[in-house]
Amino acid sequence: EETEIVMPTPKPELWAETNFPLAPWKNLTLWCRSPSGSTKEFVLLKDGTGWIATRPASEQVRAAFPLGALTQSHTGSYHCHSWEEMAVSEPSEALELVGTDILPKPVISASPTIRGQELQLRCKGWLAGMGFALYKEGEQEPVQQLGAVGREAFFTIQRMEDKDEGNYSCRTHTEKRPFKWSEPSEPLELVIKEMYPKPFFKTWASPVVTPGARVTFNCSTPHQHMSFILYKDGSEIASSDRSWASPGASAAHFLIISVGIGDGGNYSCRYYDFSIWSEPSDPVELVVTEFYPKPTLLAQPGPVVFPGKSVILRCQGTFQGMRFALLQEGAHVPLQFRSVSGNSADFLLHTVGAEDSGNYSCIYYETTMSNRGSYLSMPLMIWVTDTFPKPWLFAEPSSVVPMGQNVTLWCRGPVHGVGYILHKEGEATSMQLWGSTSNDGAFPITNISGTSMGRYSCCYHPDWTSSIKIQPSNTLELLVTGLLPKPSLLAQPGPMVAPGENMTLQCQGELPDSTFVLLKEGAQEPLEQQRPSGYRADFWMPAVRGEDSGIYSCVYYLDSTPFAASNHSDSLEIWVTDKPPKPSLSAWPSTMFKLGKDITLQCRGPLPGVEFVLEHDGEEAPQQFSEDGDFVINNVEGKGIGNYSCSYRLQAYPDIWSEPSDPLELVGAAGPVAQECTVG
């Protein structure tokens, strides 16, 4: 069975104060203080379920609960909680009031009882300025006594031996004689026993985390009914108290909801059962990243490794004397750690197998300040294989290149930092390029000519080993255009089509035995190639969608000279839409009427084969339709002044009108515009 422990607010401290040091029971005030430094209020409870009072926290994050003079009704066990909006602390230690004229009963506790080691017994007395005495059962006099030392005292047994076993209790007394004594604490039995074996301790996710991440530590043991304690850098920070744990708990989950930069460090846990403790768990190093700049990770001799061989991963950091960690994607914990005096660390992957393939990254962190870490390095892909993966060859901006232009052939694959070979069909020699971070697989061809066209492929060319087989990439056909007369391109039924409709793009050439190539602006590869028997290729586009909109062109080449292609056809813009785009409306020579002069309004749309209509102040203008989009406006009696807009419809789709253009205002010139001027 497991016990879910959400990192609770640390338990508050409960103590008593009095203004009668010789007879504290005459006026006692209980105080509760939160160690967390922030809480809204405190609740004082008696005997577990009696609600005594609730008090707001002062600036010192504490609250007073005045009890006054003790009466029989005050007898009982008190504890307090801090209480916030969505967080309730664990209970404080219980303060026991046992009578009307007697000091509160102290509480005795001890560190683990380990043979030969020093043991500390803690006696908590609740009131300041009290003396303390430690008793061992069977002995009349106190074993040890301590004067006024605050609210608690620590008794030490230097070296725990069999003779020190037994029942111990402690008492407190008033500072001045005649002493007034407390009841003895409940007895504590000290038994030297073997320690329980260390618990199993891990984090659910990786212990290398970014700020704000959620981290759960899991501490577990096969032993039943245990309480657990979580330590950070050797100090206790949280516990699953038995009183808060389900019976039979064999595990505790300690949750940090949102990790801060100061939460890094060495975490460990222990469990205990009454006086028997476990060995501490193996530590988990929690590293909080993104404090220092990222390191660089490189593979030597390279990132592709033959099975059974070894590879060194070098993590190059920025600062001296850091601790480095190597991480593999998918691995729960860092694979290796290295503490170095310099600013880089070498990690050896020895006799690698297929399971070692994957993305690796590294970090560095300081071990003195909460394990503050760097950003993660860029991932490095390590391939354990006897055969390189196939690279991919493509051209940028396109594999169809006008004569005299520039093009870059890219050989790209999942393996980086490797050399490449570019091979052209029919040529004996190949171009060779060593990979780097800046020009990973780029083969630029400037001022392209007919000699560059043809079929290309590429492959990896590692310089560090010959035992790994290589595979060629896909074949890329590089076409050079501008060597034949251009074809024409038109759309059937027209350049605008509704989504889901079919259309055909017809590329018409002038020469027989031609292969036609359809191109789209922005695409690196031709969309389609056709070798018709005649002079025209019909590129069928069924059920077009919005993404088929764009600017198309076509070229062709002859069977006798493949890859030596024609000039591009004129571009053809295709619109896949239910609503044609709006036209633009402009005025010539200007938007201001001059005496006796007309104005021509020019409506221009992006599609051919359309009919335009003009609107004046929301109504159809007198000269309603125009096929070329030109409308002549005069200003007889000032009727031409006002707002104009225009729309168009396709002749193929006469029921579909475009959006109207943006409005355009025509104005009259200052002065008597329409007034005649007579002489004599």
């Epitope: 209020e41 609740v43 409870l45 577990g48 609730t54 916030e84 909006e85």
Partner: antibody, heavy 120, light 107 residues
Framework: QMQLVQSGAEVKRPGSSVKVSCKAS????????FYWVRQAPGHGLEWMGG????????NYAQKFQGRVTITADESTNTAYMEVTNLRSEDTAVYYC?????????????WGQGTTVTVSS | DIQMTQSPSSVSASVGDRVTITCRAS??????LAWYQQKPGRAPKLLIS???SLHPGVPSRFSGSGSGTDFTLTISSLQPEDFATYYC?????????FGQGTKLEIK
């Protein structure tokens, strides 16, 4: 905003018991205190006791100690008040109320009241 | 137990009047005092908490003052809906206790 809905009116015989429920909706009862207040016909308000559900901790006015039990069920967001050994002077409207904020700053949300009539 | 005493037990006033109700505690309650308004057949409604803090949604014509043992509730300009019974309550120590109430009637 939290709402408190109380159980319906009850008619009881002297010597019997009654258990009134108060269901909170709209927000968790996790960090609130709940109180019970009664009002006899033509009289003022009388504080009976309270509970903090998260602790299961209660406090009762001395007058009701031993005869009144206040409980809460966190899983259903419901508080209960049981009065045993009913007498005719227990005839009253019983209200449950929520303390505002964590600490007590006043009872800011009240139930509609449950009328309990004790009659032979 | 801390006794809370309100005065007057009842008061008659007209719309627009300024009305003051006082509440005295038998021992100091700091500022842990609340004021409530109750209309016939309805549950009480919180007006003021912590002696002087106006509860959200309560009209600004209501105000509270005082600390220790003496407290006042003031209505600066009576409105027709203000005619009701008003109670003070201490929250300094258990048991929390109410005043006997002040009935505000139309003159």
């Amino acid at each position: 905003q939290m709402q408190l809905v109380q159980s319906g009116a009850e008619v009881k015989r002297p010597g019997s018991s009654v258990k009134v429920s108060c269901k909170a909706s709209g927000r968790s009862t996790y960090n609130y205190a709940f109180y019970w207040v009664r009002q006899a016909p033509g009289h003022g308000l009388e504080w009976m006791g309270g509970i903090i559900p998260i602790f299961g901790a209660t406090n009762y006015a001395q007058k009701f100690q031993g005869r009144v039990t206040i409980t809460a069920d966190e899983s259903t967001n419901t508080a209960y008040m049981e009065v045993t050994n009913l007498r005719s002077e227990d005839t009253a409207v019983y209200y449950c109320a929520k303390g505002s904020g964590n600490y007590y700053y006043g009872m800011d949300v009240w139930g509609q009241g449950t009328t309990v009539t004790v009659s032979s | 137990d801390i006794q809370m005493t309100q005065s007057p037990s009842s008061v008659s006033a007209s719309v627009g009047d300024r009305v003051t109700i006082t509440c005295r505690a038998s021992q100091s309650v700091g500022t842990w005092l609340a004021w409530y308004q109750q209309k016939p057949g309805r549950a009480p409604k919180l007006l003021i908490s912590a002696a002087s803090s106006l509860h959200p949604g309560v009209p600004s014509r209501f105000s509270g003052s005082g600390s220790g043992t003496d407290f006042t509730l003031t209505i600066s300009s009576l409105q027709p809906e203000d005619f009701a019974t008003y109670y003070c309550q201490q929250a300094d120590s258990f048991p929390y206790t109410f005043g006997q109430g002040t009935k505000l009637e139309i003159k």
